[in-house]
């Protein structure tokens, strides 16, 4: 299944090369010079990787029940406190994997950043379950939202029929992927226009609630602090589902060597993202608090929707659209980003040969998007996917900790390395230590499904032996697999990248 | 197809507390909100509170808090409403309601046949 | 909260009939909605967002308004259509019903 990272354990060559032309010639081929190398290209300016930051941040959490931190915190006041201290963590977090990306400049995100620091295991262990459960499980919640929403128009007196809601969703999940897998460019600008549906649905809330407080509509603000049961042992919980909701500003480290001037492009996007979004999210809650109460928005599973009805009148209506705009952006996104943490760790040596390699016209890594379709699509028409999701939350925040503490540990083992963009030290330790503390808190809150997600985490330990260790595997599994490898580079029409022939 | 299932009637002593159940049926129990709404020929109808069985999340109306304590069994699909310290005043018929779709939370499409409460010494 | 007052509190009417129930809000709201009951049964949605019917309601029946005042309309009376017909609100918290306005055939 997957090789060491050498050349092929055939024979050196083992594998089909590809030319400028788009075919895949017999050996011997000379290429015609001056001509495009087949590599991924920086097609991500500053402006791409604000959108791809914020469009993988803003889900759909925000419109329809941001009431975690309310829940857990019970009152207007704490809780928007929380949103805003979880936002100022979260941007602690995003300066240091700014750091991260500009002085390790390889796309991958905490992938890369675990393997140049711990080493392989830990490395493999996290791809491996992001391939295998949180990417599929992940893009099939947030696509399922989408299919769920942008059905809700059609079906306005009557219940959305489950499978239809199924079937629209794989529609969009191939959409997605077919996207990504015919252009870089277009699934940025894509992007681009998604993230300004986003911002413009949010603004659409903000601006009317403001207008409200003009209004002297604070009834919901007095005694912000005194709340029903805002007891101080469930904070950390409020605390936990705030720095979910900002979770997303690590994508772009996914795909640093895309980005065009990645010492600058980088900690700026970084930057700009989350303060729009920590702007965002506090003002979109003050926006609701002007219209509905505490107790109602706990209650509701469409805030937004509650909302716009009392103060937009029919745009209402535009609602589910908007919010099914903002899922289809987190899916594409998210499929962007996490099909280059692929892509690295084949190109390492830790996932197929086949996930490394490039088509030969488009320039996209078109297996590493692919391999996410049928895994998604299991997800999709199976199991309980928010209790897979719940399992493994605990895991996102072990192996980001993990991350941000080589940060640190470089800054001691390595302090002349060449680091365009530094932190001050607080920063990354605040923000392991943060991360420490929600590993914690998932383990002391919910035992069992934690207990449940370090299992499955730890399978990747066996697997890591077995396919990355063990080097005596059976000729007729190296002959299969290299079979397997050609057969899906001529079907694909891809290539490795020029640069690692 | 959805149906809201409500107890008997109830026939209690002032001071007394009562506790009505309403049993869910055809649809996912913990999607949707259930309400609770009381009919006197006095006032009409009155909108009591909800819960979010999902979530566990209530709201109450103010005229009702204290009186009134709304849960739910996420295992049997049914969701409950205890009213407490009960006087003549609290004799009605009390109904639970979902409603159509999260686009309209207030506005209720399904409704329980009613349980008439009835305090009287 | 925001009080609907409803008028008339009975009526009736002959068949063939045009009736129009009025619901008006003691402050501005952003929609109306209608349910009807007859004796001995749930209430049943009506109308919703003001002026959209719900499913199996007859075309004979329409809704309209904005801000306060809000009404509903039966084109033509029929034998059926006599029951108690309320007006709900949820624009401000908490959601509120009219009182009622009972609809008799004459």
């Known amino acids: 299944m997957v090789r060491k990272p050498v050349v092929s354990t055939i024979s050196k060559g083992g594998y089909l090369q590809g030319n400028v032309n788009g075919r895949l010639p017999s050996l011997g081929n000379k290429e015609p010079p001056g001509q495009e190398k087949v590599q991924l290209k920086r097609k991500v300016t500053l402006l791409r990787g604000v959108s791809i930051i914020i469009g993988t941040i803003i889900g759909a959490g925000i419109f329809i029940s941001p009431k975690g931190v309310l829940q857990n915190t019970g009152s207007v006041g704490m809780s928007l406190t929380i949103w805003t201290v979880c936002g100022v963590l979260s941007l602690f977090g995003a300066l240091s994997y700014a750091e991260l990306g500009t002085t390790i400049k390889k796309s991958g995100g905490h992938y890369t950043y675990i393997l140049e620091v711990f080493g392989p295991l830990p490395a493999f262990v996290r791809v491996w379950v992001e391939l295998l459960i949180i990417r599929p499980a992940a893009t099939a919640v947030i696509s399922l939202a989408f299919g769920r929403y942008i059905l809700e128009p059609f079906f306005i007196q009557c219940e959305i029929p489950e499978l239809a809601i199924k079937l629209i969703t794989a529609v969009g999940i191939t959409v997605v992927m077919v996207l990504n897998s015919m252009s870089v460019s277009w699934s940025a600008r894509i992007q681009i226009f998604l993230t300004f549906c986003k911002l413009t649905a949010i603004l659409i809330i903000i601006v009317p609630g403001v207008m409200q407080l003009i209004k002297g509509q604070t009834q919901n603000f007095k005694d912000a602090f005194s709340g029903r049961d805002s007891s101080i042992t469930r904070l950390p919980l409020a605390f936990y589902y705030g720095m979910y909701a900002y979770a997303g500003w690590f994508y772009l480290n996914f795909v640093t060597e895309e980005v065009e001037n990645p010492e600058k492009t980088i900690p700026l996007a970084i930057c700009i993202s989350m303060a729009i979004v920590t702007i965002g999210y506090v003002l979109t809650n003050v926006a609701y608090f002007t219209t509905i109460n505490a107790e109602e928005l706990l209650l509701s599973n469409a805030v937004a929707v509650t909302f716009s009805e009392r103060l937009l009148g029919n745009f209402s209506l535009a609602v589910p659209i908007f919010v099914a705009l903002s899922c289809f952006g987190s899916m594409n996104g998210g499929v962007f980003a996490v099909s280059r943490l692929f892509y690295v760790a084949s190109r390492e040596g830790h996932l197929p040969e086949i996930l490394s390699m490039i088509h030969v016209r488009k320039h996209t890594p078109l297996p590493a998007v692919i391999v996410l379709h049928p895994l998604t699509m299991i997800m999709l028409f199976s199991g309980d996917l928010d209790s897979l999701l719940n399992f493994l939350s605990f895991a996102r925040w072990l192996f980001i900790g993990l991350a941000v503490a080589g940060l640190i540990y470089l800054r001691y083992k390595c302090p002349d390395m060449h680091r365009p963009f530094k932190v001050p030290l607080f920063i990354p330790a605040l923000f392991s230590f943060t991360c420490l503390f929600m590993v914690a808190l998932s383990l002391y809150s919910d035992p069992f499904s934690t207990g449940i997600g370090f299992v499955i985490t730890l399978t990747g330990v066996p697997a890591y032996y077995l396919f990355i260790i063990w080097d005596k595997k059976p000729r007729w599994f190296r002959i299969m697999s290299e079979k397997i490898t050609r057969t899906l580079q001529i079907i694909l029409e891809v290539v490795p990248e020029e640069d690692k022939l | 197809q959805v149906q809201l299932q409500q107890s008997g009637a109830e026939l209690v002593r002032p001071g007394a507390s009562v506790k009505l159940s309403c049993k869910a049926l055809?649809?996912?129990?913990?999607?949707?909100?259930m309400h609770w709404v009381k009919q006197t020929p006095v006032h009409g109808l009155e909108w009591i509170g909800a819960?979010?069985?999902?979530?566990?999340?209530?709201a109450y109306n103010q005229k009702f808090k204290g009186k009134a304590t709304l849960t739910a069994d996420k295992s049997s699909s049914t969701a409950y409403m205890e009213l407490s310290s009960l006087t003549s005043e609290d004799s009605a018929v009390y109904y639970c309601?979902?409603?159509?779709?999260?686009?309209?939370?207030?506005?209720?499409?399904?409704w329980g046949q009613g349980t008439t409460l009835t305090v009287s010494s | 909260q925001i009080v609907l007052t409803q008028s008339p509190a009975i009526m009736s009417a002959s068949p063939g009939e045009k009736v129009t129930i009025s619901c008006s809000a003691s402050s501005s709201v952003s929609y109306m909605y209608w349910y009807q009951q007859k004796p001995g049964s749930s209430p049943k949605p009506w109308i919703y967002?003001?002026?959209n019917l719900a499913s199996g309601v007859p075309a004979r029946f329409s809704g309209s308004g904005s801000g306060t005042s809000y009404s509903l309309t039966i084109s033509s009376m029929e034998a059926e259509d006599a029951a108690t017909y309320y007006c709900?609100?949820?624009?401000?918290?908490?959601?509120?019903f009219g009182a009622g306005t009972k609809l008799e055939l004459k």
């Open positions: 309601t979902r409603p159509l779709y999260y686009r309209y939370p207030y506005y209720f499409d399904y």
């Open positions: 967002r003001t002026s």
């Open positions: 819960i979010h069985p999902g979530s566990g999340g209530t």
């Open positions: 709900q609100q949820y624009h401000s918290y908490p959601l509120t």
């Open positions: 055809g649809y996912t129990f913990t999607d949707y909100e």
